[in-house]
Each structure stands twice: as structure tokens, then as C-alpha cells.
């Protein structure tokens, strides 16, 4: 039994620096309990950027001083990263860990680059 | 750097009781699954428990289920497995190591602390 | 439980030889959650490779893992004399996570 994450390839983040994705989990069991982890790899450094545990049919709860916020849905969670910079262009890889009942699974996405672009300076106008 | 370091094995009958100590420095606890790992004389490897991250779920190999427990004290940075019931063949070098960022590898261990169960 | 089996038992070779370690899973390791450990006799083991084919920090680019589903490979391209250990395969895709026997590498 093993468990597949799938997760969109590439997202853009808007104007103001908020990206959103689904991470999708086929659960090979019945999980009440699921870890979601969102980790980015940009030249071959991981850095956790946020991680929320729910109980299924609950809400994810993330950390207050997170960047990520989220919703859960079935075996579907939809996550949003905001406060982004270009500086934070890279591959933002879905972890999921079925943490109860035993026994755990885990899956891992292939991640979904997120491209980041600083909006322009408005220019000065004369009107 | 990461540290781990055990204590608190020894020689002990059948049927008492033993609690072993992990140490962590360098990173905190909470941020990672936290192993227990045996090693019998002359023996192979056999994972043993885990307590993953915030500390509620607790997952133990068949061989110990209802025996060992797991715990850990954040203050301190500190981990531990409380072994009841002792059995002969828990006789062990026991490891505690750090799960991996992609899952549970084992990154960095301790040195071990050695078990004997001996009338 | 997934129960792994490592072959061969004991490699006899010699220091520049090449070294290949089999690891064979009795079910598929979803997504290739295999690692590979060195061990010395006295020593903790030190992990080599994770995810099937990544090396650790700080590892060698002699060592290199291969495959996917039930069947791995830890390859050693030239034996270097600090290389005669034990090597362990083990799968972290579900609980129990489960160790092979173990393969020795010895010098012949």
C-alpha cells in the first residue's frame, strides 16, 4: 500500500505575493489524524516553511505566526503561502504523514514551483 | 551541531523495569520524529518506537507494544522510553536517533546504551 | 510489514574493487522510501543514502543507491580501505519501518 501525493506543477504568485495549491493524498488507509508539511527546495537547501496536523473533517491549523493558512477537504488540502518575495521563487513540496491510526504513511509530492515577481514601483504621475 | 546522546541502560532482571534518557542539542525536539532503535549482540538492526512531533502519537514495534513507552520533556530537550516487563531478548544496545526532514531515515544517532536482561 | 532481504550475505573484495549491495522489499516501497546505513564494529550506523539514490550529507560520491519498487542497489565504485563494514537498507514508507539483515563487506 503505498501513498501518492499529487500537486500542480507551477503556480504564480500574485501581485501580492500570495501562491495557492491543492496537495492531494491518495490514503491507502483510514486516517483520523494527518500532518501536511510544506517544504521548499531552492539549490539543494530544504527549509521547512510551515507544517499544520488535523483531525479529518477539521479544519488545518496552522501556527499564528505562519505564512501558510489552509483548508482540508476529504483527502484534499488547500494551501495558501503568503508574504512572498521573489527572493522566495522555488519548488514547494507537499509532505503528508497519516500520523493515526497506526500504521503511518507517509507521501511526498513532486512539488510545485512557485514563481515569485516583486510588483513594479508605481511610477510618478502627473495627473 | 546535532547531538544525541543515551543513558540510563544497564543490567537487569526479567520482569523489572528500565528507563533510558536521549539528550538532544542542536535542534529541537519538537521539529522531528524521534526513533528508538535496538541493536541485539551480534545482531541486525530493528526500529523500535517513534514519537512523532508535538508529542500525542506514539507508534512501537510489535516486539514492545504494551511494554515501552515512550515520553519527552521539552525543557529539556529530552527523550525517553520507559521499559517495563523486560524480557531476555530485549537484551540490546538501544539507539536513539533523529528522523529525516523526508521521512523517517534516521540522520543522526547516539552513541547507544546497552540492555541486559539477565537473571 | 514490509520485510526487506539484503544479498549477499558477506561480499569479499578488495581495496579499488567495485562493491554492489542488493536490497529486495517483499512489497513495493511507495515512492522509493529506502535508506542505506554503513556500520563499524562498536559504532553507531551513519545513514549513506536516502530516498533510494540521495546522498547524505557529507557522503562520498563513491556511494550511490539505484532502484525503485521492490529491488535497490548500494554501489561502491572503488572500495576504499575505511569501506569494510556492514551495510543496512531499510524503508520508511509505513510503520513498523522495517531493516534488512545486513550485507558485510570484508577484504578478502
Known amino acids: 500500500k503505498a501513498m501518492h501525493v499529487a500537486q500542480p506543477a507551477v503556480v504564480l504568485a500574485s501581485s501580492r505575493g500570495i501562491a495557492s495549491f491543492v496537495c492531494e493524498y491518495a490514503s491507502p488507509g483510514k486516517a483520523t489524524e494527518v500532518r501536511v508539511t510544506v517544504l521548499r527546495q531552492a539549490d539543494s537547501q530544504v527549509t521547512e516553511v510551515c507544517a499544520a496536523t488535523y483531525m479529518m473533517g477539521n479544519e488545518l491549523t496552522f501556527l499564528d505566526d505562519s505564512i501558510c493558512t489552509g483548508t482540508s477537504s476529504g483527502n484534499q488540502v488547500n494551501l495558501t503561502i503568503q508574504g512572498l518575495r521573489a527572493m522566495d521563487t522555488g519548488l514547494y513540496i507537499c509532505k503528508v504523514e497519516l500520523m493515526y491510526p497506526p500504521p503511518y504513511y507517509l507521501g511526498i509530492g513532486n512539488g510545485t514551483q512557485i514563481y515569485v515577481i516583486d510588483p513594479e514601483p508605481c511610477p510618478d504621475s502627473d495627473f | 551541531q546535532v547531538q544525541l546522546v543515551e543513558s540510563g541502560g544497564g543490567v537487569v532482571q526479567p520482569g523489572r523495569s528500565l528507563r533510558l534518557s536521549c539528550a538532544a542539542s542542536?535542534?529541537?525536539?519538537?521539529?522531528?520524529?524521534m526513533h528508538w532503535v535496538r541493536q541485539a549482540p551480534g545482531k541486525g538492526l530493528e526500529w523500535v518506537a517513534v514519537i512523532w512531533y508535538d508529542g500525542r502519537n506514539k507508534h512501537y514495534a510489535d516486539s514492545v507494544e504494551g511494554r515501552f513507552t515512550l515520553s519527552r520533556d521539552n525543557s529539556k530537550n529530552t527523550l525517553y522510553l520507559q521499559m517495563n516487563s523486560l524480557r531476555a531478548e530485549d537484551t540490546a544496545v538501544y539507539y536513539c536517533a533523529r528522523g529525516g526532514v523526508w521521512g523517517s531515515y534516521f540522520d543522526y544517532w547516539g552513541q547507544g546504551t546497552l540492555v541486559t536482561v539477565s537473571s | 510489514e514490509i520485510v526487506l532481504t539484503q544479498s549477499p550475505g558477506t561480499l569479499s573484495l578488495s581495496p579499488g574493487e567495485r562493491a554492489t549491495l542488493s536490497c529486495r522489499a517483499s512489497q513495493s516501497v511507495s515512492s522509493s522510501y529506502l535508506a542505506w546505513y554503513q556500520q563499524k564494529p562498536g559504532q553507531a550506523p551513519r545513514l549513506l543514502i536516502y530516498g533510494a539514490s540521495s546522498r547524505a550529507t557529507g557522503i562520498p560520491d563513491r556511494f550511490s543507491g539505484s532502484g525503485s519498487g521492490t529491488d535497490f542497489t548500494l554501489t561502491i565504485s572503488r572500495l576504499e580501505p575505511e569501506d569494510f563494514a556492514v551495510y543496512y537498507c531499510?524503508?520508511?514508507?509505513?510503520?513498523?519501518?522495517?531493516f534488512g539483515p545486513g550485507t558485510k563487506v570484508d577484504i578478502k
Open positions: 542542536g535542534f529541537t525536539l519538537s521539529n522531528y520524529g
Open positions: 531499510q524503508q520508511y514508507g509505513t510503520s513498523p519501518f522495517t
